[in-house]
Interface confidence: medium
């Protein structure tokens, strides 16, 4: 016989609860955890349950993106009576359990953070011994990954009428502001920030018409730092080509 409950309410502290006479499931997760790219982060998750002194088999699961259906990033299983939760899945080997599920703690450590880790995570616990039950955080914890700017691509491309244009793409969180500088541009030219669809941390700025030979520099800056990269434009034989 499998008995199950899911959370039906949530207060401002992200304590997710299901209550009925003589039983109570709840999960406590913070709304958000922030950390810098390259560092590690801890996603806290603790729970309470109605099955007193349960020591049967259990599984701890973390998934990303959406509850119930999102891809699992971590899973471990503990045998009856065991406090060791044996890891069965750790995406890219970067996820490990910090908490002890036997003590109602599913807290997870994420190593070597990348901007792609910036998403919502959901903890879940399953009992499968004499008692069968499961519970999952429905609202989860948002992992907010910050990063200093990094220019990921800078290039000069041909455009109509033998002209050239320059593109600069940078990533960072907060999304960096981009600026171009170069011959006849003055000190700098601020570019309109345009995050690319589906790539929320990527920003691209275009210099539509390069009118002079020389060095063009793209600068990316946010509250965590700045980065710059340059391209060189040299036109030969009446603008029939360019060296960059």
């Amino acid at each position: 016989f499998v008995r199950t409950k899911i959370d039906t309410t949530e207060n401002l502290l992200n304590t997710e609860v299901h209550s009925s006479p003589a039983q109570r499931w709840s999960m406590q997760v913070p709304p958000e955890v922030s950390a810098e790219a390259g560092d590690a982060a801890v996603l806290p998750c603790t729970f309470t349950h109605p099955h007193r002194h349960y020591d049967g088999p259990l599984t701890a699961i973390w998934r990303a993106g959406e509850p119930y259906a999102g891809p699992q990033v971590f899973r471990c299983a503990a045998a009856r009576g065991s406090e060791l939760c044996q890891t069965a899945l750790s995406l890219h080997g970067r996820f490990r359990l910090l908490g002890n599920p036997r003590r109602n703690d599913l807290s997870l450590r994420v190593e070597r953070l990348a901007l792609a880790d910036d998403r919502r995570y959901f903890c879940r616990v399953e009992f499968a011994g004499d008692v069968h039950d499961r519970y999952e955080s429905r609202h989860g914890v948002r992992l907010h990954v910050t990063a200093a700017p990094r220019i990921v691509n800078i290039s000069v491309l041909p455009s109509p009428a033998h002209a050239f244009r320059a593109l600069c793409t940078a990533e960072g969180e907060p999304p960096p502001a981009l600026a171009w500088s170069g011959p006849a541009l003055g000190n700098s030219l601020a570019a309109v920030r345009s995050p690319r669809e589906g790539h929320g941390h990527l920003v691209t700025a275009e210099l539509p018409a390069l009118t002079h030979d020389g060095r063009y520099t793209c600068t990316a800056a946010n509250s965590l730092g700045r980065s710059e990269a340059s391209v060189y434009l040299f036109r030969f034989h009446g603008a029939s080509g360019a060296s960059t």
């Epitope: 016989f1 199950t4 899911i6 299901h18 009925s20 899973r75 069965a88 999952e136």
Partner: antibody, heavy 122, light 107 residues
Framework: EVQLLESGGGLVQPGGSLRLSCAAS????????MSWVRQAPGKGLEWVST????????YYADSVKGRFTISRDNSKNTLYLQMNSLRAEDTAVYYC???????????????WGQGTMVTVSS | DIQMTQSPSSVSASVGDRVTITCRAS??????LAWYQQKPGKAPKLLIY???SLQSGVPSRFSGSGSGTDFTLTISSLQPEDFATYYC?????????FGQGTKLEIK
């Protein structure tokens, strides 16, 4: 492509046996509980059996308990249903289905095979 | 075992109509309810899970609501491809059980 492909159905006499297979591709089936669901001709859906991701826990409908055995070979990403002592009322299309939830439970069945027909008749 | 009862057992409607199908559980199942669509000769397709979560790739005209014992599947504006049979299913306890189905036919 993520899919499930059943095989092994056919015509069998009452009291006979069949073994159904379900090959999973495009995902690691060991991460998920897997189930068999059947549908008799012109009738509704009936849950038959579920097995946990690791294969250590199995569950059966009362109508098949003691006659059917669910198993899995995670190295082959394959689910099985061994059906013994078959009866006329077991005649149905048998679907294998993946649990959306996780390794022990089925919060819903989010991926289904195309089904394989089992006919029990003399 | 938990009994799942769907109503109506069949319904006739036209393209563009709003259709509601209900499912009642014989005991409290919290939100552990899924809805499926099945067309003749095809496998069921998951539409809604945990009562109200829309499965990826399913059009937003489908929605689910309810908790406890009473649940509803709503199709806000029927499209020609929506004519099929719909099943609810509880995953609160084993044995998992399905409703008897609701056949949605063209008026």
């Amino acid at each position: 492509e993520v899919q499930l492909l059943e095989s092994g159905g056919g015509l069998v006499q009452p009291g006979g046996s069949l073994r159904l297979s379900c090959a999973a591709s495009g995902f690691t089936s060991s991460s998920y509980a897997m189930s068999w669901v059947r549908q008799a001709p012109g009738k509704g859906l009936e849950w038959v059996s579920t097995i946990s991701g690791g294969g250590g826990s199995t569950y059966y409908a009362d109508s098949v308990k003691g006659r059917f055995t669910i198993s899995r070979d995670n190295s082959k990403n394959t689910l099985y249903l061994q059906m013994n002592s078959l009866r006329a009322e077991d005649t149905a299309v048998y679907y294998c289905a993946k649990a959306i939830g996780s390794s022990w439970y089925s919060d819903a069945f989010d991926l289904w095979g195309q089904g394989t027909m089992v006919t029990v008749s003399s | 075992d938990i009994q799942m009862t769907q109503s109506p057992s069949s319904v006739s409607a036209s393209v563009g109509d709003r259709v509601t199908i209900t499912c009642r559980a014989s005991q409290d199942i919290s939100s552990w309810l899924a809805w499926y669509q099945q067309k003749p000769g095809k496998a069921p397709k998951l539409l809604i899970y945990v009562a109200s979560s829309l499965q990826s790739g399913v059009p937003s005209r489908f929605s689910g609501s309810g908790s406890g014992t009473d649940f509803t599947l709503t199709i806000s504006s029927l499209q020609p491809e929506d004519f099929a049979t719909y099943y609810c299913q509880q995953s609160y306890s084993i044995p998992y059980t399905f409703g008897q189905g609701t056949k949605l036919e063209i008026k």
